[in-house]
C-alpha cells in the first residue's frame, strides 16, 4: 500500500520503478496540468511528506525512448 | 548518530551576505535530506529551505530569491547563504536533518547559531 | 500570519491533560501532508516530538500523543509535569506554497 519513501529509499523506488528510463525529482516544465499554476512539487514533497503509491512514483519516471528506425 | 554543527559569523553587516555552515558527523551526506530553520528573537520558527543531495533544492517563496542552499559532500558539510540581509533576518538559525525515519519530520537538529544584522 | 494556525497559549496543573490544536487548510494537512509536532525548551533547539501525525519517536513518553483529522491536527499531553513547560509547534508541508510550513507555536504552561 501507499508509503512515504524519503532519503535513499525514495532514490532506490524510482530505479525500481523507472529501471533504465531514469526519472525526474520535478516534473518535466509543462508536464500535466497548466504552468500558471502555484509552485511545482517535486517527488520528495509528494511521497517523504504524505504517504505515495506506484503510479505517483512512475510519473516522475522519463519518458521512453523512441525505437531507432533501421 | 547523526550530529549537526552550525558555524558562521554572529555578525553580519546590512546588504551584505549572510553564510552559514552546517557540518554533518555520523552519517553520510548523501542519505538524508538536509534542512536550514531560523527563528527570529522572541519569534516562532521559520523554514527556509532543504535539499537533497542529488541536487534537488526547494525554498521558502519569501526568501528564494535571496537563498541559497549547496553541499560539500568531501567536507560532508551543507551550507546557507542568504544575500542582501536586513535586520529582518537578524535570529537563530538552525540545520536539521530529515533521516527518512520519521516520515518527513525533522529529526536531528544542530544546537543553532545566533546571527545579529547590524551595521 | 502563520498558514497553521496554533493557540498561543495553553496552560495546565501538573497531573492534567492539556491539548494543542493545528489549524490548516486542504492544501496542507487536508491535502494528506503529515504533520509532525516539536517541542522547544527554553534555549534550546527544538526537538521532534511527534512525526506522521501519530508516532513518537524512540525515548518519547507515551504521555505525548497526535491525532490528525481533516484539516487539523492536535497534540494531547496527559499527565502534565513541570518538564513540559515548553513552546510546541506543528509542522506539515504546503502544496500551494511547494514547502514546508510552521504553525505560530503554543508556549504551554504548567502551573502551580
Known amino acids: 500500500g501507499p508509503e512515504t519513501l524519503c532519503g535513499a529509499e525514495l532514490v532506490d523506488a524510482l530505479q525500481f520503478v523507472c529501471g533504465d528510463r531514469g526519472f525526474y525529482f520535478n516534473k518535466p516544465t509543462g508536464y500535466g496540468s497548466s504552468s500558471r499554476r502555484a509552485p511545482q512539487t517535486g517527488i520528495v514533497d509528494e511521497c517523504c511528506f504524505r504517504s505515495c503509491d506506484l503510479r505517483r512514483l512512475e510519473m516522475y519516471c522519463a519518458p521512453l525512448k523512441p525505437a531507432k528506425s533501421a | 548518530q547523526v550530529q549537526l554543527q552550525e558555524s558562521g559569523p554572529g555578525l553580519v553587516k546590512p546588504s551584505e551576505t549572510l553564510s552559514l555552515t552546517c557540518t554533518v558527523s555520523?552519517?553520510?551526506?548523501?542519505?538524508?535530506?538536509w534542512s536550514w530553520i531560523r527563528q527570529p528573537p522572541g519569534k516562532g520558527l521559520e523554514w527556509i529551505g532543504y535539499?537533497?543531495?542529488?541536487?534537488?533544492?526547494n525554498y521558502n517563496p519569501s526568501l528564494k530569491s535571496r537563498v541559497t542552499i549547496s553541499v560539500d559532500t568531501s567536507k560532508n558539510q551543507f551550507s546557507l547563504k542568504l544575500s542582501s540581509v536586513t535586520a529582518a533576518d537578524t535570529a537563530v538559525y538552525y540545520c536539521?536533518?530529515?533521516?527518512?525515519?520519521?516520515?518527513?519530520?525533522?529529526?536531528?537538529w544542530g544546537q543553532g547559531t545566533t546571527v545579529t544584522v547590524s551595521s | 500570519q502563520s498558514v497553521l494556525t496554533q493557540p498561543p497559549s495553553v496552560s495546565g496543573a501538573p497531573g492534567q491533560r492539556v491539548t494543542i490544536s493545528c489549524t490548516g487548510s486542504s492544501s496542507n494537512i487536508g491535502a494528506g501532508y503529515d504533520v509532525h509536532w516539536y517541542q522547544q525548551l527554553p534555549g534550546t533547539a527544538p526537538k521532534l516530538l511527534i512525526y506522521?501525525?501519530?508516532n513518537r519517536p524512540s525515548g518519547v513518553p507515551d504521555r505525548f500523543s497526535g491525532s490528525k483529522s481533516g484539516t487539523s491536527a492536535s497534540l494531547a499531553i496527559t499527565g502534565l509535569q513541570a518538564d513540559d513547560e515548553a513552546d510546541y509547534y506543528c509542522q506539515s508541508f504546503d502544496s500551494s506554497l511547494s514547502g514546508s510550513v510552521f504553525g505560530g507555536g503554543t508556549k504551554l504552561t504548567v502551573l502551580g
Open positions: 555520523g552519517g553520510s551526506i548523501s542519505s538524508y535530506y
Open positions: 506522521g501525525n501519530n
Open positions: 535539499f537533497f543531495y542529488s541536487g534537488y533544492t
Open positions: 536539521a536533518c530529515i533521516t527518512g525515519t520519521t516520515k518527513g519530520g525533522m529529526d536531528v
